[in-house]
């Protein structure tokens, strides 16, 4: 099981995405969640959003499955600046996964950057124009 973080932009919207890769039989009791500014106590209860993994992917001819939690910010503001983390927890086995911290930095010019993702996922956004700069 592993967890990755990513981001994508659609117009003025910013999507923060937590992706968990797991085997079919590992899904039961697993919760994926996204926290903001929670360095030590990130939990489903303190999260911005949580997703309970499907106990059944719907088909049987699958090995590893990817499940995605998507948190959408319709318009990034200074309030969204901070440190984010994707996490996952199994209520069945007690396994806990913690993704890398990543940050949203809102600049005085009205733009924002997302840092701390994989190199190819280091994003800089022009907030006003809604484009990748």
């Amino acid at each position: 099981i592993n967890i990755t973080s990513s981001a994508s932009q659609e117009g003025t919207r910013l999507n923060l995405i937590c992706t968990v890769w797991h085997k079919k039989e590992e899904a039961e009791g697993f919760v994926v969640f996204l926290c903001k500014d929670r360095s030590g106590d990130c939990s489903p209860e303190t999260s911005l959003k949580q997703l309970r993994l499907k106990r059944d992917p719907g088909i049987d001819g699958v090995g590893e499955i990817s499940s995605q939690l998507m948190f959408t910010i319709s318009q990034v503001t200074p309030l969204h600046s901070g440190t984010y983390q994707c996490c996952a927890r199994s209520q069945k086995s007690g396994i806990r996964l913690q993704g890398h911290f990543f940050s949203i930095l809102f600049t005085e010019t009205g733009n924002y950057t997302v840092t701390g993702l994989k190199q190819r996922q280091h994003l800089e956004f022009s907030h006003n124009e809604g484009t990748l700069s």
């Epitope: 499907k54 059944d56 088909i59 049987d60 001819g61």
Partner: antibody
Framework: QIQLQQSGAVLARPGASVKLSCKAS????????MQWVKQRPGQGLEWIGA????????RYTQKFKGKATLTADKSSSTAYIQLSNLVSEDSAVYYC?????????WGQGTTLTVSS | DIVLTQSPPTLSVTPRDSVSLSCRAS??????LHWYHQKSHESPRLLIK???QSISGIPSRFSGSGSGTDFTLSINSVETEDFGMYFC?????????FGGGTKLEIK
């Protein structure tokens, strides 16, 4: 005991839309895929699509994209199929079924008749 | 989409005969194949799951075998209540698909 109770027979005009229901009881509705299957008189079974009530994820066979819309209401443990722009070929029995590997529990079916 | 071909389309038998119904997949589906029986004006009923696994409440005269692309449903000593339509179904990949069916009728 597990039951899937479907809504009663429907007569609809061509071009209209209908919404059929399937109320589940006796199990945790949100953690099993609900399937919808079409059967025309004297014909075989045709898989329309499925919905996972826990998160609303739905899948369709290509033929029914744009024709069928699957939804689920967690509060009432009810799955729905909406069929739009009805034509005579939509006349059939529509079944809901729960997936546990195979489709282990089936509703009694709803007969839809499209006629002017 | 995976196509399931059932044969024969119709099978005429006498009660107490033993029969085999075939289902062939257009590509390998491992053991992700299920069998259903449907009587006229009734809902289908699951007989066998995952090619060979029995279902609680289904008589032991029903058995399934096969893997990959070729599957068989066997009925050991057919009873009158067994007549009707038999369908196979694959759950290996989206979209789920059904075979065209085999009609088991009284000779």
């Amino acid at each position: 005991q597990i039951q899937l109770q479907q809504s009663g027979a429907v007569l609809a005009r061509p071009g209209a839309s209908v919404k059929l229901s399937c109320k589940a009881s006796g199990y945790t509705f949100t953690t099993y895929w609900m399937q919808w299957v079409k059967q025309r008189p004297g014909q075989g079974l045709e898989w329309i699509g499925a919905i996972y009530p826990g998160d609303g994820d739905s899948r369709y066979t290509q033929k029914f994209k744009g024709k069928a819309t699957l939804t689920a209401d967690k509060s009432s443990s009810t799955a729905y199929i909406q069929l739009s722009n009805l034509v005579s070929e939509d006349s059939a029995v529509y079944y809901c079924a729960r997936r546990l590997g195979g489709f282990d529990y089936w509703g009694q079916g709803t007969t839809l008749t499209v006629s002017s | 989409d995976i196509v399931l071909t059932q044969s024969p389309p119709t099978l005429s038998v006498t009660p107490r005969d033993s029969v085999s119904l075939s289902c062939r997949a257009s590509q390998s589906i491992s053991n992700n194949l299920h069998w259903y029986h449907q009587k006229s004006h009734e809902s289908p009923r699951l007989l066998i799951k995952y090619a060979s696994q029995s279902i609680s409440g289904i008589p032991s005269r029903f058995s399934g075998s096969g893997s990959g692309t070729d599957f068989t449903l066997s009925i050991n000593s057919v009873e009158t209540e067994d007549f009707g339509m038999y369908f196979c179904h694959q759950s290996n990949s989206w979209p789920h698909t059904f075979g065209g069916g085999t009609k088991l009728e009284i000779k």
